[in-house]
């Protein structure tokens, strides 16, 4: 059985204020069951962007269909981007579990703001 | 076994079209990403087109944008890339590739056809 | 762009590597062509991932923006290009290609 890997293909993507972000990942397997959450930063301190399974985050949409069956596709697109939403953001695979448990973080795409074209 | 078989390719003249297609078999050819690659004589590969799963997304090389459609019947297990506006530089060995969880990355090829352009 | 160097040689029965760097990839995979024209093989995907089919003498591994194909045992039959792939649209897609040469 091949290693589950989290697949974020860009090192980093550059977006004008005011557009739409589309932030890319992948997985490699469906198992073990659990959520993927995307976080800005790391460690202790890393903020919550997105939970594919709970909260409402109303900037951010998933490219594809979450209820469609085998998606690994775990793209996200968040709208509206100012500058204080640069940073690098990380998807990571947890297991299901009480608490979920982290098993696997993509490798991490830095987002940058461009000015709004005049 | 996965196979990808391309059509015929052939000669045409500067400005006509060309539509190829490549069959599918031994994969669930509905739940996978499909690309075009090509090779033009003497050169590397070249990424031309890729189509999503489900065919509502489509992606281009800026070489070929808005002069070829890629597109897909997936009750048919088939490929499609209508070719206009051809050009010398065209001139290829075009390659169906099937990509494997993330849409850059290829896991099995066709044989390839030639596209020929030339006056 | 992705870079790669235009040609390496090896010794039968010896190790080669192969690398390719740069652009905005985070991810790399790896393509054999026999001969110019004929249809490419798939030999890496996603760094580290070899197909079923292919041989464990090779092999990938990435570390920051590089990416390497190592063949250890190298066999007559590997004299080939050697493609490196990115994950990053923005990158093209392919390297121009390494000519591995069987010594």
């Known amino acids: 059985e091949e290693e589950l890997q989290v697949i974020q293909p860009e090192k980093s993507v550059s977006v004008a204020a005011g557009e739409s972000a589309t932030l890319n990942c992948t997985a490699t397997s469906l198992i073990p069951v659990g959520p993927i959450q995307w976080f800005r930063g790391v460690g202790p301190g890393r903020e919550l962007i997105y939970h594919q399974k709970e909260g409402h985050f109303p900037r951010v949409t998933p490219v594809s269909d979450p209820t469609k069956r085998n998606n690994m596709d775990f793209s996200i697109r968040i709208s509206n981007i100012t500058p204080a939403d640069a940073g690098t953001y990380y998807c990571v695979k947890f297991r299901k579990g009480s608490p979920d448990v982290e098993l696997k973080s993509g490798a991490g795409t830095e987002l940058s703001v461009r000015a709004k074209p005049s | 076994d996965v196979q990808l078989v391309e059509s015929e390719g052939g000669v045409v003249r500067p400005g006509e079209s060309l539509r190829l297609s490549c069959e599918a078999s031994g994969f669930t050819f509905r739940n996978s990403y499909m690309t075009w690659v090509r090779q033009a004589p003497g050169e590397g590969l070249e990424w031309v087109s890729t189509?999503?799963?489900?065919?509502?997304?489509?992606y281009y090389a800026d070489s070929v944008k808005g002069r070829f459609t890629i597109s897909r019947d997936n009750s048919k297990n088939s490929l499609y890339l209508q070719m206009n506006s051809l050009r010398a530089e065209d001139t290829a060995i075009y390659y169906c590739?099937?990509?494997?969880?993330?849409?850059?990355?290829?896991?099995?090829w066709g044989l390839g056809t030639l596209v020929t352009v030339s006056s | 762009a992705l870079t790669q160097p235009a040609s390496v040689s090896a010794n039968l029965g010896g190790t080669v590597e192969i690398t390719c760097s740069g652009g905005n990839s985070n991810h790399y995979g790896w393509y054999q062509q026999k001969s110019p024209g004929s249809a490419p093989v798939t030999l890496i995907y996603a760094d580290t991932n070899r197909p079923s089919n292919i041989p464990s003498r090779f092999s990938g591994s990435t570390s920051g923006s590089t990416s390497t194909l190592t063949i250890t045992g190298v066999q007559a039959e590997d004299e080939a290009v050697y493609y490196c792939g990115g994950s990053s649209t923005g990158d093209g897609i392919f390297g121009a290609g390494t000519t591995l040469t069987v010594l």
């Open positions: 189509i999503s799963d489900t065919g509502d997304t489509a």
């Open positions: 590739a099937k990509s494997w969880i993330w849409w850059t990355f290829f896991d099995y």
